[in-house]
C-alpha cells in the first residue's frame, strides 16, 4: 500500500525541497504531525501542539502547516517518506506517502560544429537522466540523452537550439551557425 499510494516528488541535488501535504488544513484539532523516513525506520520530525518540535537533524525543518523542508538535498535523502497526522484524541486523521527522487540538475548544453562536413554536436556534461533536444530554425530534429550529432545539408547558415532537461531542471543553448560556401572551418 505504501508504494502504490506514494506521491512521486522530484528534488534537485544540493537544493532544498518542501514536502507539502495535499488537501490538508491545519486546525486546533490537530495535535501531532509525524514524519518518518522509511529506509531508516524512524521518526525524522515531529510537531506536537504546545510541545517542542522534534527534528532528527538540522537539515529538516517542520512548518506549522505540516510541510517538511529538507535542506541541501543529498543522494541519501532519496527515500520514501510518510507523514501521519493525529488529532487531540490520538486518532489517525491523515496519512500520506511521498516517494522522493533526487536528480542532479542538467548543465547548459554545449553546441559545437564543423563546417568541413557540416556536422553539429550538442552535448550535456552534467545531470541525471538528461533529455537532449535539437532544433534547427525552430523545427525539432533529434532527441537523445547526452550527445546529439547532426549533419545538416539544407543550408550553410542556420540557427540551432539545443535544450537539455530532466525532472528538476532545464537549460538551453542557441547558436547561429554560418559556414562559408566552400565548407571551410
Amino acid at each position: 500500500k505504501e508504494i502504490t499510494n506514494a506521491l512521486e516528488t522530484w528534488g534537485a541535488l544540493g537544493q532544498d525541497i518542501n514536502l507539502d501535504i495535499p488537501s490538508f488544513q491545519m486546525s486546533d484539532d490537530i495535535d501531532d504531525i509525524k514524519w518518518e523516513k522509511t529506509s531508516d525506520k524512524k521518526k525524522i520530525a515531529q510537531f506536537r501542539k504546545e510541545k517542542e518540535t522534534f527534528k532528527e537533524k538540522d537539515t529538516y525543518k517542520l512548518f506549522k502547516n505540516g510541510t517538511l523542508k529538507i535542506k541541501h538535498l543529498k543522494t541519501d535523502d532519496q527515500d520514501i517518506y510518510k507523514v501521519s497526522i493525529y488529532d487531540t484524541k490520538g486518532k489517525n486523521v491523515l496519512e500520506k506517502i511521498f516517494d522522493l527522487k533526487i536528480q542532479e540538475r542538467v548543465s547548459k548544453p554545449k553546441i559545437s560544429w564543423t563546417c568541413i562536413n557540416t556536422t553539429l554536436t550538442c552535448e550535456v556534461m552534467n545531470g541525471t537522466d538528461p533529455e537532449l533536444n535539437l532544433y534547427q530554425d525552430g523545427k525539432h530534429l533529434k532527441l537523445s540523452q547526452r550527445v546529439i550529432t547532426h549533419k545538416w545539408t539544407t543550408s550553410l547558415s542556420a540557427k540551432f537550439k539545443c535544450t537539455a532537461g530532466n525532472k528538476v531542471s532545464k537549460e538551453s543553448s542557441v547558436e547561429p551557425v554560418s559556414c562559408p560556401e566552400k565548407g571551410l572551418d
Epitope: 500500500k1 531508516d40 521518526k43 515531529q46 486518532k91 489517525n92 496519512e95
Partner: antibody, heavy 117, light 107 residues
Framework: EVKLVESGGGLVKPGGSLKLSCAAS????????MSWVRQTPEKRLEWVAS???????YYLDSVKGRFTISRDNARNILYLHMTSLRSEDTAMYYC???????????WGQGTSVTVSS | DILLTQSPAILSVSPGERVSFSCRAS??????IHWYQQRTTGSPRLLIK???ESISGIPSRFSGSGSGTDFTLSINSVESEDVADYYC?????????FGGGTKLEIE
Amino acid sequence: EVKLVESGGGLVKPGGSLKLSCAASGFTFSSYDMSWVRQTPEKRLEWVASISGGGFLYYLDSVKGRFTISRDNARNILYLHMTSLRSEDTAMYYCARSSYGEIMDYWGQGTSVTVSS
Amino acid sequence: DILLTQSPAILSVSPGERVSFSCRASQRIGTSIHWYQQRTTGSPRLLIKYASESISGIPSRFSGSGSGTDFTLSINSVESEDVADYYCQQSHGWPFTFGGGTKLEIE
C-alpha cells in the same frame, strides 16, 4: 469505556497456523492505529505488528512474511493471521490501541499461543 | 533496532518511600519513551507518555523525566498496590521495542 477482547489462541504444532481476533468497543475503531504485542514466558514484551488507520502495515522482522495484521472496520475487529509458527512464537498475545500511532494506551486481556510438538 | 536497558532488574522498597526506575536507550530518541505497569495477573497499563506527560486516571505519584538516551520513572510515595513490573517502550523507530522490565517489591 474502551474494551479490547482477544480470542483465537491455543496449542499448535510447529509449522501450523492460527488466526487471532480482537474485538474492540467503546471508541471509533476505524480512526485508531492498532497493534499486536506479545509477552514471552520469560515476561519479555515484544511488539509484533501495527496497522494504521489508513491501512499501512508494520511488522517485526522475525514475523514478516509469516504473520499478517488486518482489520475489519465495519465489525470493529483486529486480526493477526499467524502461519509457519515456531516455538519462539510461544507467548501471550495482546491487542492494543495505538494512540498517536505509538502509545499503547489500552490493552486487551491477552490470548495465549503455545507452539509445541 | 533501538535497545532499551532497564535497571535494576528488581527494586525493593518500603511503603511511603520514593522509588526511581531507569531506562537507557542505545541511541538518542528525543522524548519518544512511554512507561507501563503490569501487575502480576493483569495486562500492561499506560502510566506516562512521551517521557514526562501524565495520563488521565493515573495517580499523581507517578512521574517521568528525561530525554535523549536516559529516562526515569518515579513513584514519589510507594503504596502496596504499586507492586508490579514496570516497562519502558520507545516509539522513535521501528520496530517499537520494550525494556526488559523492573520488578518492584515492597519490603
